[in-house]
Interface confidence: low
């Protein structure tokens, strides 16, 4: 059973009065329709909820919100609804908070339809203050902050036009029209694409990219025949079009656009698509859709410069063009991604991969669980956990898996144990040691937090009916106290906390019913009195990351490096603090084969560390194009991964020599494009000739490196069909995460290409 | 409590190169940055560059690329600032000082707790 | 590089006086900006961090204020030890650089 309150547990002494003086209630005066709820800035206290209630009438909409504004933690609210003259905010923009500590906050406002341009209401007092602007332009997306400057606004209008602010929205100029998509870049550069005839849908595929690096003084255009772009750590992708027929490939840029190599991934038909599931500034994860309805593609993961692409996983599971995936980034451990896959019998596995892709395992079957009905072997099954996908068809799985960077190696999920996703009612489940172990934590779905980096979980109970009791646990979810926060249930609808996991601060956010009305209401707990004191150097221990056989000299080492961490100890009761910094010593670990991807022209044979040659490049000077430029390749068939920091050990022989030859791939850079030959004729005909005399040979090595529809078996195969039975393997990426960090609702924006 | 303890006075000759070291005490050694500061006799601060004791990075300012070198140890809890082709206006006091920790920035808060200094001068 | 320019560079006071430094970055540094105290003979002491935040231990007449280029520290009311040089430190972009000083002295 799972673990709760029995003789084992320790009870924390008097936490029912402790949490009774620090449970602080406050019921928002207004009808309950939506609500939502930001942080603003990091360790300020300062929360922002605005409440929505729409009444759609016959000729009109009748709608009204209020703004509240709390500095502590959510104990206390202020209505501040006067501060933005009771206008009503049109929440599909949300509200727009400023990157790091700026204390920023945009309100899109809902203005009547004959208005020449929006309103918007700004802050840059973490929301004491607010300034009324009346726009030149209609928005169509919210206000997108320059992650390097604050204030530094863009925005797309209705008109498709790009607008720049450079004093936070005070002053606002339309810099481009004809714009589909603008994202910012590095250095405070704007990425967007134009298109040049009728519109975004209609020129799909035909839209240049365009960058500025001076917000709109000067323009420069880096690729034509664009279907989409995207960014992800230090890579700029672009999809474009094929010249002969209707498939796009990938394209990628680590110079901003300047120049372009040909990403060696499988193209692309029109119903397909690309998605950049996660990238740092090592590599990329890249899901290749596969042709027809299937729901699944294929997961590659790339070199350092993102071109080069070794097959990481087959049927991976993700629905359609901006549909569901279960691509999960492990945050509390370097190296681990969880999703799951599509298996040839249409259910659906979870698998794991702790190396960064390199291998892919089933979860371990966790030691208190039995195997369920889906399992043929009811001796050996395998733990499988409940993302995205499961939230979208309505299962009842209230929450997806979390993970917080600075609670090492703790991951929660909900999942079942069997040989495929159940879509019986699931329970809670808690790795300790980054997803190779797993123990059931609490039966029945639940909501979820991550308090104090780690030294409290806080859980409640998913049900239709009105609850009043929440449980927490001071032990890594080992043991449970349950605390009734309130006599009155509420009709729960979300758990809050701060993002980054660090607060001691827990809302509970609901509603109460009664005849005729219903009013929102929240509950702030404060746990600061159950962790009584600071955490001192005995209440840590150290803890090696990715250890899985102790014997070995060698364990721990995850793309060439082992980290130790020091761990609070499950059975200290303290608090970290809002200071706490994860504590790691890393050491590094020799060289072996497992540190390297295949090379150009090479693959990994299935259950084989070494690569070996492709069959149909034996013999041939192996030649590639890159950023413009034929290069000649001396290897013997590795590359070292993307983030490998081994040292001695195998050390492969790599050469690449600069042919001093131009090549071109279909994405030609618009000068190029338009560039008229002025060279006699006679020139010309003589290097055809010349040309037609190698083109036998060049041609079979371009078909396969430089070009072309490419064969899946190009693709150093780390791992064709997941095994069920290898765990090893094992690190590490940092990726640029796609979540909205201080609001209230995970925001998932994966680039689709 | 907590502090850094720096290693005592040193003459120099031009051309030679002197090694500064800051032992911390207190704190997890590991978890806070170390930045490296100098001031010449009457003048103000010059900030050199820092170590990240975790991993061993380190950023220095452009004026001393390729003469500055910072190490640690954390078996010891120390770090060390090794100035190589010393001049005459490399006379200074020099500064170990931490980092001050907050969540994300860890250049963006100041510097908390400072060594008493160490008095370097370059003399022929 | 961004350059911090403090002033003034020298200002007399009495015990009891309000103070105000000043100190201009060369362009826009957020709010992160830091304040020193530096006594002869002695290491600097972090008085103010992220522009406006008092470092713990620092007494309550100290204060800071301003964002973007424009900053200033106040000490409502001069103490006898208070008579130093400040300085104040963007940490905004790298590399991190100091203003000039100013000296705080007796009237």
């Known amino acids: 059973s799972a673990p709760g309150e029995d003789e084992e547990c320790g009870r924390v002494r008097d936490f029912v009065a402790k949490l009774a003086n620090n449970t602080h209630q406050h019921v928002f005066d207004d009808l309950a329709g939506s609500v939502s709820l930001s942080w603003v800035g990091d360790s300020t206290g300062v929360i922002l909820v605005l409440t929505t209630f729409h009444v759609p009438l016959v000729i009109m909409t009748f709608g009204q919100s209020k703004l509240y504004r709390s500095e502590d933690y959510g104990k206390n609210f202020k209505d501040i609804t006067d501060l933005i003259n009771n206008t009503f905010i049109r929440t599909e923009f949300g509200m727009a908070i400023g990157p790091e500590n700026s204390g920023k906050v945009v309100l899109t406002a809902e203005v009547s339809g004959g208005s020449r341009g929006g309103r918007i209401f700004r802050s840059s007092d973490f929301a004491k203050n607010f300034v009324q602007t009346d726009l030149p332009f209609h928005p169509l997306t919210q206000m997108m902050y320059s992650p390097q400057n604050s204030d530094y606004l863009l925005a797309l209008s209705t008109e498709n036009g790009l607008w720049v602010s450079k004093n936070f929205g005070g002053k606002w100029e339309e810099i481009h029209k004809a714009v589909c998509l603008a994202k910012w870049g590095s250095d405070n550069t704007i990425f967007f694409t134009t298109y040049a005839n009728g519109s975004c849908k209609a020129d799909l595929g035909a839209l240049e990219l365009w960058r500025t690096s001076d917000l709109g003084k000067s323009f420069k255009t880096i690729g034509v025949k664009i279907y989409s772009f995207g960014l992800g750590g230090r890579f700029l992708f672009a999809s474009v079009m094929a010249d002969k027929d209707t498939t796009r490939r990938i394209h990628v840029s680590t110079d901003q656009g300047d120049t372009w190599s040909m990403a060696q991934l499988p193209s692309v038909g029109q119903e397909q698509f690309y998605s950049i599931l996660a990238a740092n500034d090592d590599m990329v994860f890249m899901h290749v859709d596969e042709p027809g309805d299937t729901g699944f593609g294929t997961i590659f993961t790339s070199d350092d410069r993102g071109i080069v692409y070794s097959k990481s996983l087959d049927r991976h599971l993700y629905t359609t063009t901006g549909g569901e995936t279960d691509f999960t980034n492990v945050t509390s451990l370097r190296g681990v991604y969880i999703t799951s896959v599509l298996s040839e019998d249409n259910s659906i596995q979870t698998m794991i991969t702790f190396d960064q892709g390199g291998r892919w395992t089933h979860l371990r079957k966790p030691e208190n669980s039995e195997c369920d009905a889906t399992a043929k072997n009811k001796n050996e099954c395998s733990l499988h956990i409940h993302a995205s996908y499961s939230i979208s068809q309505k299962l009842n799985v209230p929450m997806a898996p979390l993970s917080e960077p600075n609670a090492v190696g703790i991951v929660i999920a909900h999942g079942s144990v069997g040989d495929a996703i159940s879509v019986m009612v699931p329970d809670v489940y808690i790795s300790d040691d980054g997803g190779y172990s797993w123990t059931k934590m609490l039966e029945g779905p639940h909501y979820y937090t991550i308090l104090d980096s780690g030294g409290i979980i806080v859980a409640i109970e998913h049900s239709s009916r009105p609850i009043n009791v929440i449980k927490f646990s001071t032990d890594e979810g080992q043991c449970w106290q349950t605390y009734t926060f309130t006599r009155d249930p509420i009709y729960f609808t979300g758990l809050a906390s701060e993002p980054g996991a660090r607060s001691m601060n827990i809302s509970i956010w609901g509603f109460t019913e009664s005849f005729l009305t219903s009013q929102w209401v929240s509950y702030t707990i404060d746990f600061k009195d159950i962790l009584e004191r600071n955490c001192e150097e005995k209440d840590y221990t150290i803890w090696l990351a990715h250890s899985t056989d102790p014997e070995d000299y060698e364990d721990g080492c995850i793309l060439g490096y082992k980290e130790q961490f020091l761990r609070l100890r499950k059975s200290s009761v303290c608090q970290n603090g809002r200071d706490y910094v994860v504590t790691k010593q890393p050491s590094i670990c020799l060289c072996s084969l497992e540190d390297f991807l295949c090379d150009f022209g090479y693959y990994r044979p299935e259950n084989d560390s070494k690569c070996v040659e492709q069959p149909e490049l034996k013999g041939h000077d192996l030649e590639f194009c890159l950023y413009g430029r034929e290069e000649h390749l001396t290897t013997n068939g590795y590359r070292k991964i993307p983030g490998d920091k081994c040292q001695g050990g195998v050390n492969p022989v790599r050469e690449v020599k600069d042919l001093k030859k131009k090549c071109t791939s279909n994405f030609l850079s618009p000068e190029k494009q338009n560039s008229k030959s002025n060279s006699v004729p006679i020139i010309l005909a003589i290097v055809g000739l010349m040309l037609v005399t190698v083109v036998a040979g060049v041609l079979i090595v371009k078909k396969y490196v430089c070009g072309g529809r490419f064969l899946v078996h190009r693709y150093s195969v780390l791992q064709q069909h997941a095994e069920a039975n290898g765990v090893d393997g094992v690190d590490a990426l940092d990726t640029a995460s796609h979540t909205n960090k201080s609001g209230y609702h995970d925001d998932s924006d994966e680039d689709l290409l | 409590q907590v502090q850094l303890v720096q290693s005592g006075a040193e003459v120099k000759k031009p051309g030679a190169s002197v090694k500064v070291s800051c032992k911390a005490s207190?704190?997890?050694?590991?978890?806070?940055?170390m930045h490296w500061v100098r001031q010449a006799p009457g003048q103000g601060l010059e900030w050199m560059g820092w170590?990240?004791?975790?991993?061993?990075?380190?950023r220095y300012a452009q004026k001393f690329q390729g003469r500055v070198t910072m190490t640690r140890d954390t078996s010891i809890s120390t770090a060390y600032m090794e100035l190589s082709r010393l001049r005459s206006d490399d006379t200074a006091v020099y500064y170990c000082?931490?980092?001050?920790?907050?969540?994300?920035?860890?250049?963006?808060?100041?510097?908390?707790?400072w060594g008493q200094g160490t008095t370097v001068t370059v003399s022929s | 590089d961004i350059q911090m320019t403090q002033s003034p560079s020298s200002l007399s006071a009495s015990v009891g006086d309000r103070v105000t430094i000043t100190c201009r970055a060369s362009?826009?540094?957020?709010?992160?900006l830091n304040w020193y105290q530096q006594k002869p003979g002695k290491a600097p002491k972090l008085l103010i961090y992220a522009a406006s935040s008092l470092q713990s231990g620092v007494p309550s007449r100290f204060s800071g204020s301003g964002s973007g280029t424009d900053f200033t520290l106040t000490i409502s009311s001069l103490q006898p030890e208070d008579f130093a040089t400040y300085y104040c430190?963007?940490?905004?972009?790298?590399?991190?650089?100091f203003g000039g000083g100013t000296k705080v002295e007796i009237k």
């Open positions: 362009q826009s540094i957020s709010s992160y």
């Open positions: 170590i990240n004791p975790n991993s061993g990075a380190t």
């Open positions: 430190q963007q940490s905004d972009v790298s590399p991190i650089t």
């Open positions: 000082a931490r980092g001050k920790r907050s969540s994300g920035w860890y250049e963006g808060y100041g510097m908390d707790v």
């Open positions: 207190g704190y997890t050694f590991v978890a806070y940055y």
